[in-house]
């Protein structure tokens, strides 16, 4: 019961840490950036992944897709690649996990595979939630960057003067959200990795095998039963050997020499 | 890089009107403000308007009710109205756009400036 439980919260954390991963790729609000101040009027913009939009006091908004730029910063296409490997991870783990949930029966589908399928989809998000997590890091280490840089410089350019402006950068909500939703989807990822050990557990129950010699010259065959890990083929403890071999279960009989345990 | 080019400065009689326009050109990412500015012979340079890509309007005091400035986003091209046109608003006016950077700050373009001159 602890297992299906730990395995069902682990798939709706990471549902939901993935969810957010996806919104926070699309979300424009990255970064938010003053632009320009006045008694009257104040602009500012806020920039996303793909696109950059200007918002006014007065509620004008205007978005417009980088497509339009030359030269966008290599950290920027590095972010959206981390985001969307997070997202296809995180997808595909969403799938398998689907398949891999105690409570959903499938065909004559065992534990074994389906504690397969929950350790392949924990890692999944384990690593979808990583992705998202540098990916959000990675950005905001370059707003940072970026503002440090380029403090206020003054040159003359063609058909005039050049200024920089230093203007205030804040994180953007798609940051935290995205922060958010990475720890999410990488906690999902580690309760599906411990659900999947309770779905197979290590089952070391020997049982305990006389055997009788049909004769005096028959000698014991050893190594009569494997241990079964949940894994192998011999997970229901059947016989090896059948020559004068019963289980404890089949035939009581008194200690000798020739007993194995 | 942006080019600023200005241009409708000249002589003027008091009480006259000029037109200025200043169009950008070149590979940039957005205009998100427009604004002229004005030196007059030995003195700062001060604020007489500024227009933002939605079209808010800020006028200096010592123009304010006898200008209009006005832009077209799709041009990158501002215009600055002056109308009762006075003595002491002889000047150079220089044309000023702030152009986003995404990811970076903005920068701010200045242009040669084209003279103004009120005089009878």
């Known amino acids: 019961m602890a297992v299906t439980a730990c395995q069902g919260l682990g798939f709706v954390v990471s549902l939901i840490g993935i969810a957010g991963i996806i919104a926070a790729t699309c979300m424009d609000q990255w970064s938010t950036q003053d632009l320009y101040n006045n008694p009257v009027t104040a602009v500012f913009n806020y920039q996303g992944l793909w696109r950059s939009c200007v918002r006014e006091s007065s509620g004008f908004t205007e978005c417009r897709g980088y497509f339009t730029l030359l030269g966008l910063p290599a950290m920027l296409q590095a972010v959206r690649a981390l985001m969307i490997v997070g997202i296809v991870l995180g997808a595909i783990g969403l799938l398998v996990s689907i398949f891999a949930l105690k409570c959903i029966r499938i065909g004559s589908m065992e534990d074994s595979a389906k504690a397969n399928m929950t350790l392949t989809s924990g890692i999944m998000f384990i690593v979808s939630g990583l992705c998202a997590i540098a990916g959000v890091s990675v950005f905001a280490n370059m707003l940072v960057t970026n503002f440090w840089m380029s403090t206020a410089n003054m040159y003359t350019g063609m058909g005039g003067m050049v200024q920089t402006v230093q203007t205030r950068y804040t994180f953007g909500a798609a940051l935290f959200v995205g922060w958010v939703a990475g720890g999410l989807t990488l906690i999902g990822g580690v309760m599906m990795c411990i659900a999947c050990r309770g779905l197979a557990p290590e089952e070391t129950n020997y049982k305990a095998v006389s055997y009788h010699a049909s004769g005096h010259s028959v000698a014991y065959k050893p190594g009569g039963f494997k241990a079964s890990t949940g894994f192998g083929s011999n997970t229901k403890n059947k016989k090896i050997y059948d020559g004068g071999a019963r289980t404890e279960d089949e035939v009581q009989s008194y200690p000798s020499k020739h007993d194995y345990v | 890089e942006v080019q600023l080019v200005e241009s409708g400065g000249g002589l003027v009689q008091p009480g006259g009107s000029l037109r200025l326009s200043c169009a950008a050109s070149?590979?940039?990412?957005?205009?998100?403000?427009y604004g002229w500015y004005r030196q007059a012979p030995g003195k700062g340079r001060e604020l007489v308007a500024t227009?933002?890509?939605?079209?808010?309007?800020y006028y200096a005091d010592s123009m304010k009710g006898r200008s209009t400035i006005s832009r077209d986003n799709a041009k990158n091209t501002v215009y600055l109205q002056m109308n009762s046109l006075k003595p002491e608003d002889t000047a150079v006016y220089y044309c000023?756009?702030?152009?986003?950077?995404?990811?970076?700050?903005?920068?701010?373009?200045w242009g040669q400036g084209t003279l103004v001159t009120v005089s009878s």
């Open positions: 000023n756009v702030r152009v986003e950077v995404p990811f970076m700050q903005p920068n701010d373009y």
């Open positions: 227009i933002t890509r939605g079209g808010s309007t």
């Open positions: 070149g590979s940039f990412f957005r205009i998100v403000m």
